[in-house]
Structure formats: structure tokens, C-alpha cells
Interface confidence: medium
């Protein structure tokens, strides 16, 4: 399932709430085709969360996932 702020493969706005770090399974960058640069976090429930890559909380969550999953961003 997609979060309400995720439209297909792109983000039109950023999630403004707290990022549930402990419930994140992976993250990826949206493509250059998208209106906004964004990092999308995917939760254990399969929900997608659009996030601002410049936000300190987002960077912290990415670092957490990088430590947890050594593969880093799951992009081809």
C-alpha cells in the first residue's frame, strides 16, 4: 500500500509527522522524472512515506537503515 503522500512513483508532498524509524524496512530515492527530490521509506506494513532528503530526521533515518541493512539504498 502507498501512503497518501505518494503518487505512483513520485512524491508530490513530504510527510510532516515523525518517522517511525524502528518500523522501517528499506528506503529509496525517487527518480529524476519526479517533481520533487524525495526519499521514500517503506514500513513493515508496506506503507510508503515521502520524505525531504534535506531534513535532518530523514538523514538520521537513512543512516539507521544503512547500519541495519548494509546494502544501503535499494536501487538498481
Amino acid at each position: 500500500a502507498r501512503g497518501t503522500n505518494v503518487g505512483r512513483e513520485c512524491c508530490l508532498e513530504y510527510f510532516k509527522g515523525a518517522i517511525p524509524i524502528s518500523r522501517l524496512t528499506r528506503w529509496y530515492k525517487t527518480s529524476g522524472e519526479c517533481p520533487k527530490d524525495a526519499i521514500v521509506f517503506v514500513t513493515v506494513q508496506g506503507k510508503s512515506i515521502c520524505s525531504d532528503p534535506k531534513d535532518k530526521r530523514v538523514k538520521k533515518a537513512v543512516r539507521y537503515l544503512q547500519r541495519t541493512w548494509k546494502g544501503g539504498p535499494q536501487e538498481s
Partner: antibody
Framework: QVTLKESGPGILQPSQTLSLTCSFS??????????VGWIRQPSGKGLEWLAH???????RYNPALKSRLTISKDTFNNQVFLNIASVDTADTATYYC??????????????WGQGTLVTVSA | DIVMTQATSSVFVTPGDSVSISCRSS???????????LYWFLQRPGQSPQLLIY???NLASGVPDRFSGSGSGTAFTLRISRVEAEDVGVYYC????????FGAGTKLELK
Amino acid sequence: QVTLKESGPGILQPSQTLSLTCSFSGFSLNTSGMGVGWIRQPSGKGLEWLAHIWWDDDKRYNPALKSRLTISKDTFNNQVFLNIASVDTADTATYYCARIYFGSSLAWFAYWGQGTLVTVSA
Amino acid sequence: DIVMTQATSSVFVTPGDSVSISCRSSKSLLHSNGNTYLYWFLQRPGQSPQLLIYRMSNLASGVPDRFSGSGSGTAFTLRISRVEAEDVGVYYCMQHLENPTFGAGTKLELK
């Protein structure tokens, strides 16, 4: 019916600022997911993306030209503007504007203007 | 920047025949979401470019199904079956995984 039309000075001298206008109809930059981009093409050569602007005023620039480019919009009058500072003869080209839409059919540059030829000459 | 290479500058085709035009990228255009961010445009003589294919294999609105796109992450092909006179022009590939960059173009001419 979506249409775009570019206008510019035609000829200008080196070191001047090039001001381009894209006037469009058939869509609105008030619409979420809508954008307009600029692409140029020197005579007999290939295409180069310059910049684009989104409905929410988010702007993107070609990194190689970023310091010289300024893109802006007038949503009410359905116009997008591009300024290129300190032009040189290498900026001689046909300049196109094109529509971008993130929506039911996400496709970049699906609609183009006819282009406007700009010559930089001393 | 991702570099797009169209190694063949021109191709000559007999009307009614098929032709393939190739393009390569310096980096894989396959995203983790499954999309491949490769576009094809046709610029007919004296005209503006026209979108043919987006995301490697999707036909743009109003484009005849004689055109088709395929490829892998870095190697792409535009195929035109039953070439017609109106297909003459320059074909450009464009990547959009990152900021858009175009190939140098391949000119299609009739024999």
C-alpha cells in the same frame, strides 16, 4: 488543446542577458503536478535541457549552466520565463519550451513549442 | 551527468522495411521501482521534437504502433516496422533517471 509558444529578442550581443518567454494555453501551472521546461538546440546539433519549473515554484537547472540561468513563472498569465546571463556566441540556438506533467500519464516533454531562434553576435 | 551515446549518426532505410536505432547510457537507467527512465523523440526536418516512447517501452499518445522501444538497463533500441516517408528525421534518446540528458541523435533517411 495544449499549445506553447516561445518568444525572444532574435539577436543580441555577447555579455548581454537573454530573456525568453514561453506563453502557453490548454493547461495551467495552478494544476498540481504541472511544469514547463526549457530545451535548446544549436543549429544542426543536438538537444540540451536547460531548466524547468513546477506548479509549486520548485525550480531545477542544468548544473553546467546553473550560475547563468534564472527560471520563473507568471501563473495568472500562463507564462514561463528564462533568463540567461552573460551570453556568448555558444548560446546561439533555437530555444524550445515544453510541458511536463506528473499525473495520470506521466510523460516529460509531451508537448513542445515551435521554438525561437536566438543569435548572439558582436 | 549520465552520458547518452548514439553511436550511429545516420541510417538509410527502404520504405516498408524495418529499422532499429540504438542508444546506450553510461549508467543503468533501471530504478528500484521497476521503471527504466529512457525516452525517445523524433525531430522531423524543420519541426520541434515529438515524444515517441517514454519509460523505455511505453508508446506516447497518438504515436503509431509501428514504433516500439525495448532494452536493458544501459542498452536501448527503438524499432520502426514498415518505415514510411513521414518517419524521416532525427531520433534522440533521453535519460531521466537524473537530470535529463540527450543522445547526439540518429538521422533516418530513405534509400
